[in-house]
Interface confidence: medium
């Protein structure tokens, strides 16, 4: 069937359109184009005779039409009046005619739109704004954009006038945005420039910063005021209702108690005509005096005296605080606070109570600290220590002994030999000693303030022959795989070599054996039961040598995993069950049995006469070593077969 296709269907003014003919019949004589939906000679545009290839313009020809041999019609430089229907009349050789109608629409190219507004400075929560998209254009669609996005759904937004007008009711500061309008028709789309809506708002209730309302006398007061507002607010300050200045910040240096009062900030928006105020109450406190500590005893004696520390001055309705060693007071039965916390009493002072101590007075703003106070606790003397620790010396050497005892004030020292006073010095020196210098050497320490004295006695032996040494131990019953043992060869002697033997042989090389203190101390780390041997130490010098008696190490170990014997697990009914449990352990362990989880007797041997299949089950032996604190156990299954059945069958 003959059809006409318009390419394009929607045509912009000034462009061209092609009326394309489809299914043109064969054996044609010619054809003619007409404006409109029917063949009308008055509205003929152009005719075409195929045989002569002659095109003849008609009354409706405008000079912009071109006809092609395939009957298609091109119309150039389209104008608005070209809109409508076009009819093709085809004359065939048999003089039978055919007709077909096509159409197209003409639209103008849209100009760039612009936005007009009925209110350039609307007031928040009061005014409405109507935006209109200009110009008004026929057959155009109007669209709106807010911040380059399509319009949000809002009851305050209304489109009217064919969407050409956008009205914002009761504008808010959040409506301050970029607005654009767009016009569209089938052949073009144009978007306007942005219009920024300038909403007047505020001022909101001002905020005064900083928030603190308490100040100390002598500080600077610096208050700042801010209120959200468009245009920006103008600020005024009032103190106790009296106008001060028209600034956003209020600064008063070196304030006094007289500056206490109500501070009002007023924000004013000249465009909206609105005022808002905020009031803050400022309190200025007088500077309290710096506290100090008094003591009822400046030189207390350890374990005898109490000390009462008092925080001065006494101020009514004040909180007193205490610190010891820069920390809050520890909980101690020896520390007592008075009801008002002003007095801290130390009962039965010790040398560790020296401090420093601080007290504080708390006011509304801060805590004022006193200077630290140190207690001078009188103590000691403790038992004196005589050094060096040697007790054996060879003739001809110099004897130099020093004595020290912890004491406050420092102790005064005296030396006695065999009870006879020698000298009042901390050190005792005797040159080129002989065997006659052997004896009891006593150091006496005296504290003149407390009146206390303490003594220590040391036996000094001067001999060319070395004494028989002995072995001391720091642990007489070490636990296997847990404890270490340190053997020390006594006595400590100058210019002496120390030697060790284990089971009569020199020390084996082992990472668990360590010699120290000039080989005088032998340490066994992580002892094992194999360390239970005879240990001998020896001393020698250029003149003589001697060995100690052997010391046998008693290592506590076990209990190891026990063994239940006999190993049989199958028995015949009627037999006697006699199970023995053994575990390697030092000391010997305690034994107990459980059958099927039920505790039985506390013996090494479990005996059950004439067993039956009821005696089937689990037999557990438990071993416990009270010395090592360790336990162990083993479980064994026993199967009792009825007489005459083969072992291993279950009951």
């Amino acid at each position: 069937k003959l059809t006409i296709e318009s390419t394009p269907f929607n045509v912009a003014e000034g462009k061209e359109v092609l009326l394309l003919v489809h299914n043109l019949p064969q054996h044609l004589f010619g054809y003619s184009w007409y404006k409109g939906e029917r063949v009308d000679g008055n509205r003929q545009i152009i005719g075409y005779v195929i045989g002569t290839q002659q095109a003849t313009p008609g009354p409706a020809y405008s000079g912009r039409e071109i006809i092609y041999p395939n009957a298609s019609l091109l119309i150039q430089n389209i104008i608005q009046n070209d809109t409508g229907f076009y009819t093709l009349h085809v004359i065939k050789s048999d003089l039978v005619n055919e007709e077909a109608t096509g159409q197209f629409r003409v639209y103008p190219e849209l100009p760039k739109p612009s936005i007009s507004s009925n209110n350039s400075k609307p007031v928040e929560d009061k005014d409405a704004v109507a935006f209109t998209c200009e110009p008004e254009t026929q057959d155009a669609t109007y669209l709106w954009w807010v911040n380059n996005q399509s319009l949000p759904v809002s009851p305050r937004l209304q489109l009217s006038n064919g969407n050409r007008t956008l009205t914002l009711f009761n504008v808010t500061r959040n409506d301050t945005a970029s607005y654009k309008c767009e016009t569209q028709n089938p052949v073009s789309a144009r978007r306007s420039d942005s219009v920024i809506l300038n909403v007047l708002y505020g001022p909101d209730a001002p905020t005064i910063s900083p928030l603190n309302t308490s100040y100390r006398s002598g500080e600077n007061l610096n208050l700042s005021c801010h209120a959200a507002s468009n245009p920006p607010a103008q600020y005024s300050w009032f103190v106790n209702g009296t106008f001060q200045q028209s600034t956003q910040e209020l600064f008063i240096p070196n304030i006094t108690v007289n500056n206490s009062g109500s501070y009002t900030c007023q924000a004013h928006n000249s465009d909206t005509g609105l005022n808002r105020t905020t009031v803050t109450t400022i309190t200025v406190y007088a500077e309290p005096p710096k506290p100090f500590i008094t003591s009822n005893n400046s030189n207390p004696v350890e374990d005898e005296d109490a000390v009462a520390l008092t925080c001065e001055p006494e101020i009514q309705n004040t909180t007193y605080l205490w610190w010891v060693n820069n920390q809050s007071l520890p909980v101690s039965p020896r520390l007592q606070l008075s009801n008002d916390n002003r007095t801290l009493t130390l009962l039965s002072v010790t040398r560790n109570d020296v401090g420093p101590y601080e007290c504080g007075i708390q006011n509304e703003l801060s805590v004022d600290h006193s200077d630290p106070v140190i207690l001078n606790v009188l103590y000691g003397p403790d038992d004196p220590t005589i050094s060096p620790s040697y007790t054996y010396y060879r003739p001809g050497v110099n004897l130099s002994l020093s004595c020290h005892a912890a004491s406050n004030p420092p102790a005064q020292y005296s030396w006695l030999i065999d009870g006879n006073i020698q000298q009042h010095t901390q050190e005792l020196f005797i040159s080129n000693i002989t065997e006659k210098n052997s004896g009891l050497y006593t150091c006496q320490a005296n504290n003149s303030a407390s009146g206390h004295s303490r003594t220590t006695v040391k036996t000094i032996t001067v001999s060319a022959e070395l004494p028989k040494p002995s072995i001391s131990s720091n642990n007489s019953k070490p636990v296997e795989d847990k404890d270490a043992v340190a053997f020390t060869c006594e006595p400590e002697a100058q210019n002496t070599t120390y030697l060790w033997w284990v089971n009569g042989q020199s020390l084996p090389v082992s990472p668990r054996l360590q010699l120290s203190n000039g080989n005088r101390t032998l340490t066994l780390f992580n002892v094992t039961r194999n360390d239970a041997r005879a240990y001998v130490c020896g001393i020698q010098n250029s003149v003589s040598a001697n060995r100690s008696d052997p010391v046998t190490l008693d290592v506590l170990y076990g209990p190891d995993t026990p063994i239940i014997s006999p190993p049989d697990s199958s028995y015949l009914s009627g037999a006697n069950l006699n199970l023995s449990c053994h575990s390697a352990s030092n000391p010997s362990p305690q034994y107990s049995w459980r059958i099927n989880g039920i505790p039985q007797q506390h013996t090494q041997v479990l005996f059950i006469a004439k067993i039956t299949p009821n005696n089937n089950g689990t037999y557990a032996c438990f071993v416990s070593n009270l010395a090592t604190g360790r336990n162990n156990s083993i479980v064994k299954s026993i199967t009792v077969s009825a007489s005459g059945t083969s072992p291993g069958l279950s009951a």
Epitope: T561, P562, R594, N596, G597, N616, G617, T618, A620, F622, N632, S633, I634, V635, K636, S637, I638, T639, S650, A651
Partner: nanobody, 122 residues
Framework: QVQLVETGGGLVQPGGSLRPSCTAS????????MGWYRQASGKQRELVAL???????NYADSVKGRFTISRDNAKDTVYLQMNSLKPEDTAVYYC????????????????WGQGTQVTVSS
């Protein structure tokens, strides 16, 4: 610790059957024996049946031929098939597990369940 969860107790008529089960969970190195004990009101706890890892069984005389104990080692679960139940079987039935905690069979420990009530009554 080892936790034991017992299920399957309840009320049954004389001559009826029940099959309670008990599942062990927690730090089990090796379960050696699993079993059931019971305690009737006013009486001492007594062994009902047990089964060891090496298939040693033990039954109380009063349940032989009626009760069968079985064990699923993979699930650490023990079952007690109770047939031909009698009123004197009424008791709280406790699951019992015996564990060993190292390769040398040393360190034996017992664990007990909370108990499940079995009531045989017409």
């Amino acid at each position: 610790q080892v936790q034991l969860v017992e299920t399957g107790g309840g009320l049954v008529q004389p001559g009826g059957s029940l099959r309670p089960s008990c599942t062990a969970s927690g730090s089990i190195f090796s379960i050696y024996a699993m079993g059931w004990y019971r305690q009737a009101s006013g009486k001492q706890r007594e062994l009902v049946a047990l089964i060891t890892r090496d298939e040693v069984f033990n039954y109380a005389d009063s349940v032989k031929g009626r009760f069968t104990i079985s064990r699923d080692n993979a699930k650490d679960t023990v079952y007690l098939q109770m047939n031909s139940l009698k009123p004197e079987d009424t008791a709280v039935y406790y699951c019992w597990v015996e564990t060993v905690n190292d390769h040398y069979n040393s360190g034996v420990e017992d664990y007990w369940g909370q108990g499940t009530q079995v009531t045989v009554s017409s």
